[in-house]
Amino acid sequence: MEPRAVADALETGEEDAVTEALRSFNREHSQSFTFDDAQQEDRKRLAKLLVSVLEQGLSPKHRVTWLQTIRILSRDRSCLDSFASRQSLHALACYADIAISEEPIPQPPDMDVLLESLKCLCNLVLSSPTAQMLAAEARLVVRLAERVGLYRKRSYPHEVQFFDLRLLFLLTALRTDVRQQLFQELHGVRLLTDALELTLGVAPKENPLVILPAQETERAMEILKVLFNITYDSVKREVDEEDAALYRYLGTLLRHCVMADAAGDRTEEFHGHTVNLLGNLPLKCLDVLLALELHEGSLEFMGVNMDVINALLAFLEKRLHQTHRLKECVAPVLSVLTECARMHRPARKFLKAQVLPPLRDVRTRPEVGDLLRNKLVRLMTHLDTDVKRVAAEFLFVLCSESVPRFIKYTGYGNAAGLLAARGLMAGGRPEGQYSEDEDTDTEEYREAKASINPVTGRVEEKPPNPMEGMTEEQKEHEAMKLVNMFDKLSR
Amino acid sequence: MGCTLSAEDKAAVERSKMIDRNLREDGEKAAREVKLLLLGAGESGKSTIVKQMKIIHEAGYSEEECKQYKAVVYSNTIQSIIAIIRAMGRLKIDFGDAARADDARQLFVLAGAAEEGFMTAELAGVIKRLWKDSGVQACFNRSREYQLNDSAAYYLNDLDRIAQPNYIPTQQDVLRTRVKTTGIVETHFTFKDLHFKMFDVGGQRSERKKWIHCFEGVTAIIFCVALSDYDLVLAEDEEMNRMHESMKLFDSICNNKWFTDTSIILFLNKKDLFEEKIKKSPLTICYPEYAGSNTYEEAAAYIQCQFEDLNKRKDTKEIYTHFTCATDTKNVQFVFDAVTDVIIKNNLKDCGLF
């Protein structure tokens, strides 16, 4: 049914005809996400009519149908202005049961109505800056947070929980004031950590899950994204003991997430959100990643369970295959691994053994090849300085921040970017916090050491002198040509 | 009959081993000597790399050393405002407030009479009023059309602090200073068993013998280029844009017979300035044939290719390209949340409509 016909039916006002028109429109457009310009004015007119009814109150019998039509039109950018008003948003919030209320509604809300309203709000907040502002002013986050806190007590359908969390994600992603409010006033980290535990269905002492079901995966990912939004600009501050305990507890849940698989093919996505959030934990709380007790089948190194570190390394390997969105794919996991390595000697030694094993192949440049080391060295000259920096920093820490060792494994040419940035091109401070770390040379390396070009990091035969056979005068003449060039350059 | 060695034989074997070891160590010592040539145009960020070494490495500049830069800071500040005022005439830009013309005249008088390392309150007041003028700001915004230090705005915006009688330059102030480097500055440093000699080559033609020893057996050339130079208009005495000038020299050096097997470390500096500029000044100013978008990623990659493609010995000669932002020491301390904004944006992008 065309929007004009629906709008005409609405204006005549006969209830059954209106409902039938809306139903027909909904059926036809349930999967429409782009709209024809030719009917834009008709859709805008229909949107205005829907809004006027919405603001006066929808009849209980047909609320879901009306809200479905609103949801479809809220996908159309040209209709956003009609829906993004204070009254419309308030009406939708009331139907979603997230308006600040003087009295709790005595009867349980209709879940279908609640769900449709939440979907409308998600569409509006995603697409309309005005709706974002109005939603923040209406403090929708308060009742959303309250409802998240109720998941333990009352059973809400998966979809309601998912859209609650999605709306929370959108509000915190798009509004810094809401982010702050959820983080501070509304105890967001505790609230969502609690929700995450409930969703994962684990207590931190238990063994990791095998596979997280599809719905739980969806909800967990939304929770992880909201937690990311509210912690990324907050946890850079020092945390007190009470907060540190909370973040450590969150860390134990994230440890579970890293070790768990997700249903379908969503494991990497799930791990991605987990790793992003790990990067926001206060550094002193990352020790929980190495706190898993040893059990049969776990990977032990220097008496420490390395399962989580190993899982993160495997995740990094997977992510390095991608070319698209490289920065956000690899920087978080590299950051987490770097900090673990920086603070924990066993983690550093384990990672070094995996990533920078003692050098054997000294005939190939460090950036050539398919080993993890080669891929990371390649990133050290990446166009994106953030990518370059995290890759270089990771390898530098694995070298115990020893410049000679760093050059040995990566070559001075590749290392120059980090060294220049840190003011270490001409050496550096004496080795500090890592002095106890030894580096072992293989027989192959020792044999070839004298022939290794420190700049390229590989064995190179001494090149013939290009000036061989020239007289001093000729050499001087050539040199002066260069000098003239440099003179030009430095003017 | 046993195969035991006599005492003399044993001693002879030991002596022979020792000689071999010493020969090998001598060979290693020679092989482990790394000779670096540091090259770059006037404001390529070359000297900043050297200064940066000093700042983060060791404990930075001492207060005494910082004090010695006071005169340079003042000179840079005064030269910058003078360059802008002169350019106003050339670009036919009027002062926003006509009264500033008197200040401009006064500036030349006071600047000429200024004692090195001192800035009078009167001179500071004149500079401050001029810098605030809308005409001066308009001219500053067109600085790509004349020669102006990158640090101009940094010092002029901070004039209140700099003009204090008890002013001592900060590490960041020192990093921003601009002094013409001449001749060769040789730096030696050692990484464990690697002995580095870095020759910072200025443009002065000092004695020839010195140059020859400089060019022989170079392991790597560090070549600095300011990415942000791409849109600078030619000065009257220039034949080509500074970026093209750098490329021409890079070509000559990269393919010069002295440096047949010499690796090149190419520093494309001032990426922060470039990132800002590229939003407003298209890359076609420098490369008319460029057909890509004016995003940092695409434009920077194009410049990188322009330089790397000049290498005629791709199979034997390595070019290591690094994009850097030399003046920001904070930028180089490890940033844990380098990507948070991008993550949120992408998480939003992945959110569909319902």
Epitope: R139, E146, G149, L186, D194, E242 | -
Partner: nanobody, 126 residues
């Protein structure tokens, strides 16, 4: 020992206003629902008003609707009761109470509340 301390009670004329405050001794209370109850001599304890942990949901007893307002300031771990248009029948001892469950949204029933203050007397003379 967790404490709830009420203040602000006193003797007022009918039609006057009064503001009660209740401050908790621990930060965790900012995650609990809190309420005000009252008990007049010889009567049952009744709910005056309650507020969820985040302040998004409020409950009022029928007799005070439109006259009393409950609010909270989680940064100060304090809950307030603003009483306007007071009547002699509002005379009672007013108790502050808290539910000891994290992220609780509150309730009309006294049995749901785990912590109680000592009470503050409010007397409204005609």
């Amino acid at each position: 020992q967790v404490q709830l301390v009420e203040s602000g009670g006193g003797l007022v004329q009918a039609g006057d206003s009064l503001r009660l405050s209740c401050t908790a001794s621990e930060r965790a209370f900012s995650r609990y629902a809190m309420g005000w109850f009252r008990q007049a001599p010889g009567k049952e304890r009744e709910l005056v008003a309650a507020v969820s942990w985040a302040g998004g949901t409020t409950y009022y007893g029928d007799s005070v609707k439109g006259r009393f307002t409950i609010s909270r300031d989680n940064a100060k771990i304090t809950v307030y009761l603003q009483m306007n248009s007071l009547k002699p029948e509002d005379t009672a001892v007013y108790y502050c109470a808290a539910e000891a469950r994290e992220f609780s949204v509150g309730s009309y029933y006294a049995t749901e509340y785990d912590y109680w203050g000592q009470g503050t007397q409010v007397t409204v003379s005609s």
